[in-house]
């Protein structure tokens, strides 16, 4: 069971300092941006991180949403990352959900975050280069200290 608590506005970056944004095709991508670029591209660079109370001791449960024309929420259905047109619900009566991730602070690196899927244990949001694009994907942690699954989250509130 997950019960919604509070939300905050955040900018999410990979460890190469590229900014996560949602493009015109609703794809989550990373791109080099100056602070002014980041502001100019809002609200596509501003993510709503909603925190949820979890009935099990697994970590800080969150959803990641963005509000352009409508609110879309990040999903990892079938291990494929996409934004679905939906508001983060107030309650989820299940122990797993494709839209719930556990936000984890890496021990020894307070400012580095990981997002583990509640549906697929051991799978994390990651940045992966595909041709010329840096995409947000869901990836099984296959090596210790994998930088691709680490992010910084800057609160904008």
């Amino acid at each position: 069971y997950f019960g919604k608590l509070e939300s905050k506005l955040s900018v999410i970056r990979n460890l190469n300092d590229q900014v996560l944004f949602i493009d015109q095709g609703n794809r989550p991508l990373f791109e080099d941006m100056t602070d002014s670029d980041c502001r100019d591209n809002a609200p596509r660079t501003i993510f709503i991180i909603s925190m949820y109370k979890d009935s099990q001791p697994r970590g800080m449960a969150v959803t990641i949403s963005v509000k352009c024309e409508k609110i879309s929420t990040l999903s990892c259905e079938n291990k494929i990352i996409s934004f679905k047109e939906m508001n983060p619900p107030d309650n989820i009566k299940d122990t797993k959900s494709d839209i719930i991730f556990f936000q984890r602070s890496v021990p020894g690196h307070d400012n580095k975050m990981q997002f583990e899927s509640s549906s697929y244990e051991g799978y994390f949001l990651a940045c992966e280069k595909e041709r010329d694009l840096f995409k947000l994907i869901l990836k099984k942690e296959d090596e210790l200290g994998d930088r691709s699954i680490m992010f910084t989250v800057q609160n904008e509130d």
């Epitope: 109370k53 936000q103 602070s105 307070d110």
Partner: antibody
């Protein structure tokens, strides 16, 4: 880096209560779990319970249920552990520990507070 | 009271490899991650290994963790005098809905 600073040593009489504080500085407080772990002289570690401040409610080990109360004050980034009906076996060092990766991964520890229960 | 079983003591000479075992059951280690803590004399415990085999930054790669079934182990290679400490394993126990620690293992460097 987060620092957890605990209140000073206490000497208590059997049957009384003790309240130990744990102040966090240098990091996020409200969304990470704070647990209390005790260690009797020459003994091992024993988890008493924990709280995620933003949740407001605490979880307790069965052994301490009804005798321990764990609270958190988000405005001062301070967690508290109160243990009542003290007995001599409660003489121990009490540690607060923060868990930022997972509620069960204690990545930051306070310096410990010695509570001595003696008549 | 102690749900996870560790040997009370282990020892080794400098440069040697030692392992510390931690035995549990399906209600804890069998279905959950294991963490390890090092407690130097007179100090608070310190996180050494989390999620079975992950090392926090600053922990030397001489320390490694593994898990198989309902048991876990901590290996220390190239033993050094400063490794002399108490080591604790920890997991989650579903039956008691509680965090559980092993009884601790005292490592002596000969």
């Amino acid at each position: 880096q987060v620092q957890l600073v605990q209140s000073g040593a206490e000497v208590k009489k059997p049957g009384s209560s003790v309240k130990v504080s744990c102040k966090a500085s240098g990091g996020t407080f409200n969304s990470y779990a704070i647990s209390w772990v005790r260690q009797a002289p020459g003994q091992g570690l024993e988890w008493m319970g924990g709280i995620i401040p933003i949740y407001g409610t605490a979880n307790y080990a069965q052994k301490f249920q009804g005798r321990v109360t764990i609270t958190a004050d988000e405005s001062t980034s301070t967690a508290y552990m109160e243990l009542s009906s003290l007995r001599s076996e409660d003489t121990a060092v009490y540690y607060c520990a923060r868990a930022a990766y997972h509620p069960l991964v204690f990545d930051n520890w306070g310096q410990g507070t010695l509570v001595t229960v003696s008549s | 009271d102690i749900v996870l079983t560790q040997p009370p003591s282990v020892s080794g000479a400098p440069g040697q490899r030692v392992t510390i075992s931690c035995s549990g059951s399906s209600s804890n280690i069998g279905n959950h991650y294991v963490n390890w803590y090092q407690q130097l004399p007179g100090t608070a415990p310190k996180l050494l290994i989390y999620r079975n085999n992950h090392r926090p930054s600053g922990v030397p790669d001489r320390f490694s963790g593994s898990k198989s079934g309902t048991s876990a182990s901590l290996a220390i290679t190239g033993l050094q005098s400063e490794d002399e400490a108490d080591y604790y394993c920890q997991s989650w126990d579903y039956s008691g809905f509680s965090t559980v620690f092993g009884g601790g293992t005292k490592l002596t460097v000969l």
